[in-house]
Amino acid sequence: MNGRVDYLVTEEEINLTRGPSGLGFNIVGGTDQQYVSNDSGIYVSRIKENGAAALDGRLQEGDKILSVNGQDLKNLLHQDAVDLFRNAGYAVSLRVQHRLQVQNGPIGHRGEGDPSG
């Protein structure tokens, strides 16, 4: 019997300082590039090693970016979203949604990574 997969959704404000090579991540999504079914939101698809986002440590692959410097990312074309990040300035405030997968296994089952084992 398989356990049910649930998601714990949290939001966080992340303030990044643009580094020498920029913010250091890739995005997918947009009204013309739906990465997630029925969702045209903007998602982080890659964190560049040693880039500003990686060094800060809070932004993760799979995070949904809700806004940049207070500007909502809803209903944007993919390239318009990219341009928004490029033109966001030196100090960049991101409102992000983290989605953590929580595995609810059958009663009595202990997962491989359970520290109590």
Epitope: G22, N26, H78, R86
Partner: nanobody
Framework: EVQLVESGGGLVQAGGSLRLSCAAS????????LGWFRQAPGKEREFVGT??????STADSVKGRFTISRDNAKNTVYLQMNSLKPEDTAVYYC?????????????????????WGQGTQVTVS
Amino acid sequence: EVQLVESGGGLVQAGGSLRLSCAASGRTFSTYTLGWFRQAPGKEREFVGTITWSGSSTADSVKGRFTISRDNAKNTVYLQMNSLKPEDTAVYYCAAAIGSSVDSDYPSDPLEYDYWGQGTQVTVS
């Protein structure tokens, strides 16, 4: 995990043409940034060109001779090489990153790419 397989290399005379192909796995191929790089014996890996969601670009050394295109229905990216020169001799690699960089229109640094093919040899005599 994205897998890339290049094909189309070979031996060609100077002035000739070749078309390299790179077939990729993955259901979200259309979102990939795809690059071509090359490495000649004893030299560093060199950027050839890239294609993103918004367009394509090639290095100055091949501009006007090489073009990059993609077929999202076939999960394949192409490098059309015309007017080949002996100095184009190298192993050609396809590389991919998921999504668009928020920092660079056309990423040319190998570190911007996570997935690499095994390479295909191009020899121009």
